[in-house]
């Protein structure tokens, strides 16, 4: 994960280590779950599109008394534009399927790390 | 209804600066991240820049960049764009947008037209 | 920075024609990519995004489809008030730069 940071473009707030400390956030709940995460919570999953931040912000908020992915919670805010709630979804919100938030947060981090791959971050 | 009705457009010289203003009404403004849009005349759509819901972030074209801030007084349901340092190659109108989850462009303004000439 | 090329430029069509748009990216952009309708005189207005996804008031004869590099806009059967330039767009995962194709005009033979 050390070397992602030059894939981020410098600047604006956030900075360029951004998106590696989110990334790397989501590998320290991965790697460090024990019990289940959330105590097995379950959240809508979501498209992974160009604006997955929004729609993974307004999946997780609605987790509460989670510890493990308060700093997540905080992360993914800013990366979305727009004020997320909780009960909020927006229009293009795809509520068909619950899975728990650790299959969630594993496949954020696969897609994630996808694009990296891709060179798909400026 | 969303409205979004952009002013402060008209013609310039270069190196005037200038700022444009969209007021919004139909929704909840301080809710949203905001863009501007630009088109020349006859010409494609560009974007210009977005600021977050709480004006927390900003991001600009790189043909911007320097030259223009995005910013928004959510008391007011206003968005700004200040123009310094204008070129003949800033002519164009200018599009207020709305963003909404997946969808960054969902409701446009009408545009106001600046014209950078001597 | 992915650029996107549309083709073709201008598309000469009559009323009840099928009309296929083309719009490649320099490189992948998954799904994520969104069709605009513009008319002269008139803002952009939304017609599909995610590439296959019809937006609110998106008649049914608009259709997307493709992923990757290669996205097609579909109008099955050519209305009057279809003729327009119609702009593919796409967005980056991180910053958010947002970036228009060139367009492509539909106008009547």
């Known amino acids: 994960l050390t070397c992602l940071g030059g894939f981020a473009s410098p600047g604006p707030v956030p900075p360029s280590t951004a998106l590696r400390e989110l990334i790397e956030e989501l590998v320290n709940i991965t790697q460090n779950q024990k019990a289940p995460l959330c105590n097995g919570s379950m959240v809508w999953s979501i498209n992974l599109t160009a604006g997955m931040y929004c729609a993974a912000l307004e999946s997780l908020i609605n987790v509460s008394g989670c510890s493990a992915i308060e700093k997540t919670q905080r992360m993914l805010s800013g990366f979305c534009p727009h004020k997320v709630s909780a009960g909020q979804f927006s229009s293009l919100h795809v509520r068909d399927t619950k899975i728990e938030v650790a299959q969630f947060v594993k496949d954020l981090l696969l897609h994630l790390k996808k694009l990296f791959r891709e060179g798909q971050f400026n | 209804e969303v409205q979004l009705v952009e002013s402060g457009g008209g013609v310039v010289q270069p190196g005037r600066s200038l700022r444009l203003s969209c007021a919004a009404s139909g929704f909840t403004f301080s809710n949203y991240g905001m863009h501007w849009v630009r088109q020349a005349p006859g010409k494609g759509l560009e974007w210009v820049a977005i600021i977050w819901y709480d004006g927390s972030n900003k991001y600009y074209a790189d043909s911007v960049k320097g030259r223009f801030t995005i910013s928004r007084d959510n008391s007011k349901n206003t968005l700004y764009l200040q123009m310094n340092s204008l070129r003949a190659e800033d002519t164009a109108v200018y599009y207020c947008?709305?963003?909404?989850?997946?969808?960054?462009?969902?409701?446009w303004g009408q545009g106001t037209l600046v014209t950078v000439s001597s | 920075e992915i650029v996107l090329t549309q083709s073709p430029a201008t598309l000469s069509s009559s009323p009840g024609e099928r009309a296929t748009l083309s719009c490649r990216a320099s490189?992948?952009?998954?799904?994520?990519l969104a069709w605009y309708q513009q008319k002269p005189g008139q803002a952009p207005r939304l017609l599909i995004y995610d590439a296959s996804n019809r937006a609110t008031g998106t008649p049914a004869r608009f259709s997307g489809s493709g992923s990757g590099t290669d996205f097609t806009l579909t109008i099955s059967s050519l209305e009057p008030e279809d003729f327009a330039v119609y702009y593919c767009?796409?967005?980056?995962?991180?910053?958010?730069?947002?970036?228009f194709g060139p367009g492509t005009k539909v106008d009547i033979k």
């Open positions: 490189q992948s952009v998954s799904s994520y």
């Open positions: 947008v709305k963003g909404s989850g997946d969808i960054p462009f969902d409701y």
């Open positions: 767009h796409q967005r980056s995962h991180w910053p958010p730069i947002f970036t």
